[in-house]
């Protein structure tokens, strides 16, 4: 028995070959012996049943001369999954058609971090097929009647070429995924105390009309609980602020990419935030983490102190030195001090490996008065 795979809604070609490689009488039937179509010697295609009943069934008249009498079934339905019989030259050939339906749950337009389940449904009780989907960038996902893609990323967007294999027979179909998300999962902003702060949240996709709502929650390092800094709506790509905290005095841009500014980086703002964006007609939310690290350098009571506040990595080093001189103190911690510093220009550096994340300078005056 020959096996043919077909996808619901598409076409399938069931083979039937003459050993003589020339035109001959043939008939295609269902397994219950009802005639579908055939050729009875005059080179004319004869259809069984009413025209509306079998209007999806056809053959390739151009192939008859070569001894090929395929049955073409268009607009495949799940109920077409059955055994078909081709009668010619006093023999019968059985062809089994396996029609499968592909469903994508929750759909092919998803949010970053969500999962996609691809399911093959069929009426026939076939053994497990192999389903394999390959992205144009090379990523391959495989399964059987159920194929899962978890924690989708923006890079997973675009066309996937999928193959269903059963008993060495293959059928291809494509799917176009659209994974909506931010360009970066998280970002860190390093600022000296008093500097202006800008946070940007660029999206990794473009749509003509983008509608939804969002909020930025902030967990300051020095605070016991998080606080909603701003809530906003997004309508046709226009951002409108709904509610904003009075401290800090935040401003938000009215057009994409989402953009927020703080007039000053202050120690009490150092910490991390989570911007969430809920898009209309989508379940779930997009998230982007943003971190603010603030450096403060001050001279008090004959002690020069450099401190960083906010989420730093344990590998980061804080260095306090007089400009153009060797490091006076350099430690893997968030505060460094020099007692009785010499007069002159001092520099504090926050670095990770050989990369300087930020630096701040302070002028130490002889009278113990400081000038940043």
């Amino acid at each position: 028995k020959t096996l043919v795979l077909g996808k619901e809604g598409e076409s399938a070609e069931l083979p039937c070959e003459s050993s003589q490689k020339k035109i001959t009488v043939f008939t295609w039937k269902f397994s219950d012996q009802r005639k579908i179509l055939g050729q009875h010697g005059k080179g004319v295609l004869i259809r069984g049943g009413s025209p509306s009943q079998f209007d999806r069934f056809d053959s390739k008249k151009g192939a008859w001369e070569k001894g090929s009498f395929p049955l073409i079934i268009n607009k495949l339905k799940m109920e077409d999954s059955q055994t078909y019989i081709c009668e010619l030259e006093n023999r019968k050939e059985e062809v089994e058609l396996w029609v499968f339906k592909v469903t994508f749950s929750p759909g092919t337009s998803l949010l970053q971090g969500q999962s996609l389940t691809l399911t093959l449904d069929s009426n026939s009780k076939v053994s497990n097929p192999l389903t394999e989907c390959k992205h144009k960038k090379g990523k391959v996902v495989s399964g059987s009647k159920v194929l899962s893609m978890s924690n989708l990323r923006v890079q997973d967007s675009d066309f996937w070429n999928c193959t269903v294999t059963l008993d060495q027979k293959k059928n291809w179909f494509g799917m176009t995924l659209s994974v909506l998300g931010f360009q970066k999962a998280s970002s860190i902003v390093y600022k000296k105390e008093g500097e202006q702060v800008e946070f940007s949240f660029p999206l990794a996709f473009t749509v003509e009309k983008l509608t939804g709502s969002g909020e930025l929650w902030w967990q300051a390092e020095r605070a016991s609980s998080s606080k909603s800094w701003i809530t906003f709506d997004l309508k046709n790509k226009e951002v409108s602020v709904k509610r904003v905290t009075q401290d800090p005095k935040l401003q938000m841009g009215k057009k994409l990419p989402l953009h927020l500014t703080l007039p000053q980086a202050l120690p009490q703002y150092a910490g991390s935030g989570n911007l969430t964006l809920a898009l209309e007609a989508k379940t779930g939310k997009l998230h982007q983490e943003v971190n603010l690290v603030v450096m403060k350098v001050a001279q008090l009571n004959n002690t020069l102190t450099c401190e960083v506040m906010g989420p730093t990595s344990p590998k980061m080093r804080l260095t306090l030195k007089q400009e153009n001189q060797e490091a006076r103190v350099s430690e893997e911690q968030k505060v460094v001090q020099v007692v009785a510093p010499e007069t002159g220009l001092w520099q504090c550096l926050l670095s990770e490996g050989d990369k300087v994340k930020m630096d701040s300078r302070i002028q130490v005056l002889s009278r113990g008065v400081n000038q940043t």
Epitope: Q196, E198, K235, E238, Q251, M252, L262
Partner: antibody
């Protein structure tokens, strides 16, 4: 060519009301954000109010909030500014301006209509 | 609201001079700033949008730039028709705010 024509200005007593209109031609009104900008005699430009293309979002300068209302009628391609509780400091030439497709700038301006608030 | 501080308020210059006008924003406003020219009795006209995009029909002697929250309009070689009042406008967020204006006069 896109044209904006303001009307409705005039002399009004303090505490009175006026409604300014801005008729637009040569554009699909609902596509663009619109603004009202004013200029007091011998002074600089002051942005007064704005409305999104859909008409869903409206915005005001602090100096007019609660007294002025911006609306639009897309079927008439007309922008309005309802001015209530007028004060002497509202005396100015009022311009209506159309914003670019992506709110990039005010690319088309009307010639202005004069509002005088005086007793 | 975001404050825009424009300087100088007035400026005397001669034809052929290079002139710069600056605006400082009280908050970061990305590149969401435009420059407008206004002549007496006329409506303003946009010269530059988004910090540095020259509008069609505007002579190339006009240019715009940004450094942090400082924005600059430069006229490389003043022409007689350039004597006017110039304004910056932040359209980063509502309420929009104009600078106080710079009146450019013939020396």
């Amino acid at each position: 060519e896109v044209e904006l024509l303001e009307s409705g200005g005039g002399l009004v007593q303090p505490g009175g009301s006026l409604r300014l209109s801005c008729a637009a031609s040569g554009l699909t009104f609902s596509t663009f954000a619109m603004s009202w900008v004013r200029q007091a005699p011998g002074k600089g430009l002051e942005w007064v109010s704005g409305i999104s293309g859909s008409g869903e979002n409206t915005y005001y300068a602090d100096s007019v909030k609660g007294r002025f209302t911006i609306t639009s009628d897309n079927s008439k391609n007309t922008l309005y500014l309802q001015m209530n509780s007028l004060r002497a400091e509202d005396t100015a030439v009022y311009y209506c301006a159309k914003e670019g497709y992506n709110w990039n700038y005010m690319d088309v301006w009307g010639k202005g209509t004069t509002v005088t608030v005086s007793s | 609201a975001i404050q825009m501080t424009q300087s100088p308020s007035s400026l005397s210059a001669s034809v052929g001079d290079r002139v710069t006008i600056t605006c400082r924003a009280s908050h970061g406003i990305r590149n969401d700033l435009g420059w407008y020219q206004q002549k007496p009795g006329k409506a303003p006209k946009v010269l530059i949008s988004e910090t540095s995009s020259l509008q069609s029909g505007v002579p190339s002697r006009f240019s715009g730039s940004r450094s942090g929250t400082d924005f600059t309009l430069t006229i490389s070689s003043l022409q007689p028709e350039d004597f006017a009042t110039y304004y910056c406008l932040q359209d980063y967020t509502y309420p929009y705010t104009f600078g106080q204006g710079t009146k450019l006069e013939i020396k």
